[in-house]
């Protein structure tokens, strides 16, 4: 921003009323009126160009310094060409000297040269030559000087003529202020410019109404330079929640709009499924039945829990069940749907029911499922199972109602035993098997059926309560088909796969494990 000038003295504006002191009195400088640019103006002029050793002083009135630290002195003047005055070349000058003196009081007409300090010799950029003078083309010069730091209550300026033909048309003394400024939604007060050229005065800004320094942000600061210019802005303010930047101010969000945090962004329209917000809203309330999860941004539409999984099937395979379902028809407006599977088992004889999470095994953890299928194994035979698949999303926890679908399945058989060959010889095969522990209590005996491969007319059966058996009296180097089946009080369980095991040939005899 441009510097603000505070004028302490303006000769041209005073209309000749200032009554400056001339020394020697009645000689040298003279106050006169003239016409310039069709306007009457006052000026102090001196033109003693023929006599040598001129020492004519013009002193201003005492100027109260006030708060100024460095003053700027703008002079507008004309200087006539010494060549206009034949015979005066030796004594004629084309410069004059500018002085100042500080004091705490007005000395009135008591003028003492020794109190004055020279600021500079003032030389014109352009002199008024004879032809310009004749044509009324005055060459006006503008020179500026500055002095500081000033410390006393006031000061005088003085102009020393040493034999020039000079007219002072304007003497303007001012100091500079950095003007009141609104920047980055911060207000910076009018500040007096410092007196030392390299220094920059640091000025703290204050946030405008309804603006704040963002968390972790720097407080607004600017630097006021000697020339009254604001420089090097640091930090900023942002419109607080519920307000947006309009030019240099923070304005409340209009009804139907909101802003949830201090930021540079404008107010946003209330999202879907929200109630119309009042003026200055920081968020928009959800419509009835719609919710906002704690982690949801305020800009996100309000959502609701999903409907139940659309279609659920339970396919039994021995002591296993594969559950499959399709996503809810209504997602509630969210994408963070997960599924939870719970299991209940009922004993057919007693009709008693209870949870079965501890006794069954899931192909993946049954809570927070993102896929739409799961396999449940280790189910007990001759038991009724009810599976519940619940759909949940980020706002399900905000309501008491649940969205679920159930499917029931009866397990009529044990799971097929898993059979392995433990050892073999030329005439025997040692076989073992396993079934899930929860089912073992319901098994009465295991029935092992075996026969020679290719012989469909005869087979042998062995029963045992244990989990292994050795089949003897077998033919060497012969392949046998072996199957194991659990026997329960209710009947036969599911049979295992039919395995092909081969006895050793006589050459490779010895009881070798496979």
């Amino acid at each position: 921003a441009q510097g603000k000038e505070v004028v302490l003295l303006d000769f041209a504006a005073a209309g000749g009323e200032l009554g400056w002191l001339t020394h020697p009195y009645g000689k040298g400088w003279d106050l006169m009126q003239n016409i310039m640019n069709d306007m009457p103006i006052y000026m102090y002029s001196v033109c003693n160009v023929m006599s040598g050793d001129q020492d004519n002083w013009l002193r201003t009135n005492w100027v109260y310094r006030g708060e100024a630290e460095r003053i700027f002195i703008e002079l507008k003047f004309t200087v006539r060409d010494c060549n206009s005055f034949p015979g005066g070349a030796s004594s004629c000058k084309e410069t004059f000297n500018l002085y100042y003196a500080e004091s705490d009081l007005d000395y009135g007409t008591n003028f003492q040269k020794r109190l004055f300090t020279k600021i500079d010799t003032i030389a014109p950029d352009e002199i008024t030559v004879s032809s310009d003078f004749e044509a009324r083309h005055v060459k006006l010069n503008v020179e500026e000087r500055s002095v500081g730091p000033l410390t006393r209550k006031g000061f005088y300026l003085a102009f020393q003529d040493i034999g020039a033909c000079v007219a002072l048309l304007s003497v303007r003394v001012y100091y500079k202020k950095c003007p009141e400024l609104l920047q980055g939604l911060a207000h910076f007060p009018e500040t007096i410019a410092g007196s030392d050229a390299p220094s920059l005065a640091t000025v703290a800004g204050t946030c405008v109404d309804h603006a704040v320094v963002p968390p972790g942000g720097e407080e607004p600061r600017m630097h006021c330079a000697v020339d009254g210019e604001w420089l090097v802005p640091i930090g900023q303010c942002l419109c607080q929640a519920g307000y947006e930047k309009v030019e240099d101010a923070c304005q409340a969000c209009s009804p139907g709009f909101f802003k949830f945090e201090a930021s540079e962004s404008p107010c946003l329209e209330c999202p879907e499924h929200t109630l119309p917000s009042p003026e200055g809203a920081t968020s928009c309330e959800c419509e009835e039945g719609f919710f906002r999860a704690p982690q949801d941004p305020a800009s996100m539409p309000c959502t609701r829990p999903p409907s139940a999984p659309h279609y659920l099937t339970a396919v039994g395979m021995g002591a296993k069940v594969e559950l499959r379902w399709t996503p809810p028809q209504d997602s509630g407006g969210r994408e963070d749907i997960v599924y939870s599977v719970t299991c209940e088992q009922c004993w057919p004889e007693s009709g008693e029911c209870g949870p079965c999470e501890a006794s069954v095994r899931y192909s993946e953890p049954p809570h927070g499922l993102t896929r739409t299928s799961v396999t449940v194994s280790d189910l007990e035979p001759h038991m009724n199972y009810t599976f519940t698949v619940e759909a949940r999303n980020g706002v399900s926890g905000l309501v008491t109602s649940r969205s679920f679908r159930t499917a029931s399945v009866s397990i009529n058989q044990t799971e097929p035993p898993k059979v392995r060959l433990e050892g073999r010889s030329t005439t025997s095969l040692s076989v073992s098997w396993s079934i899930p522990p929860p089912q073992q209590s319901r098994v009465w005996k295991y029935e092992v059926t075996y026969r020679k491969k290719g012989d469909s007319n005869s087979y042998n059966v062995r029963r045992t309560e244990g989990f292994s058996v050795t089949l003897d009296d077998l033919a060497p180097d012969t392949t046998y088909l072996v199957q194991v089946q659990a026997l329960t009080q209710e009947g036969q369980g599911a049979g295992s796969k039919v395995h092909e095991f081969q006895t050793l040939s006589p050459e490779g005899s010895g009881n070798l494990a496979v």
Epitope: M32, I35, F85, V138
Partner: antibody, heavy 122, light 107 residues
Framework: EVQLLESGGGLVQPGGSLRLSCAAS????????MLWVRQAPGKGLEWVSR????????KYADSVKGRFTISRDNSKNTLYLQMNSLRAEDTAVYYC???????????????WGQGTMVTVSS | DIQMTQSPSSVSASVGDRVTITCRAS??????LAWYQQKPGKAPKLLIF???TLQSGVPSKFSGSKSGTDFTLTISSLQPEDSATYYC?????????FGGGTKVEIK
């Protein structure tokens, strides 16, 4: 005191010559443009001639052009008007005057002499 | 040449009266016009320059104004010492020319 004092007037026959002088005092003479103005008996004012500060710039009324010469000697603070081929109609009080400004060429005349009478008659 | 036509040629007024003298230029002269007062047997005295600027030391009862090519000198309250002939003069261009004069008398 700022003053201009004319001299050199008198009675002269038609066709004759006179040299008027104007002595300046109380101010620095050299920067100012100077002028001659005349006033015939019972008549109004008539501008005659002007000279710039350096003496190099001169102007004349058509009625005296070629007959009168204006000059100055800044070292003597004196203005001159050499009048040749005088005519009866040149009879007048001759005033020297100072242009009022050293800053802007301005032909308003702020200082006047008391005048010297020139009579052209046979 | 620029002709300066002054009117009236004479005026007789009482002490305390407001007196107005007009000067018309034959062509535009901007503000380059002066007014002089001349008393019998004396040299002219500069009253106003630049059409309206009062010369230092001249009483404020004298004022000047401009309207186009018409210029006016006004004496706001005539006093016996104001009895004189008043001349206008243009200094916009050469030859410098004066008006014919206006003689002001006290009744």
């Amino acid at each position: 005191e700022v003053q201009l004092l004319e001299s050199g007037g008198g009675l002269v026959q038609p066709g004759g010559s006179l040299r008027l002088s104007c002595a300046a005092s109380g101010f620095t003479f050299s920067p100012y443009d100077m002028l001659w103005v005349r006033q015939a008996p019972g008549k109004g004012l008539e501008w005659v001639s002007r000279i710039g500060s350096s003496g190099g710039y001169t102007k004349y009324a058509d009625s005296v052009k070629g007959r009168f010469t204006i000059s100055r000697d800044n070292s003597k603070n004196t203005l001159y008007l050499q009048m040749n081929s005088l005519r009866a109609e040149d009879t007048a009080v001759y005033y020297c005057a100072r242009a009022r400004s050293v800053v802007v060429s301005s032909d308003a005349f702020d200082i006047w002499g008391q005048g010297t009478m020139v009579t052209v008659s046979s | 040449d620029i002709q300066m036509t002054q009117s009236p040629s004479s005026v007789s007024a009482s002490v305390g009266d407001r007196v107005t003298i007009t000067c018309r230029a034959s062509q535009g002269i901007s503000k380059w016009l002066a007014w002089y007062q001349q008393k019998p047997g004396k040299a002219p005295k500069l009253l106003i320059f630049g059409a309206s600027t009062l010369q230092s030391g001249v009483p404020s009862k004298f004022s000047g104004s401009k309207s186009g090519t018409d210029f006016t000198l006004t004496i706001s309250s005539l006093q016996p010492e104001d009895s004189a002939t008043y001349y206008c003069q243009q200094y916009n261009d050469y030859p410098l020319t004066f008006g014919g004069g206006t003689k002001v008398e006290i009744k």
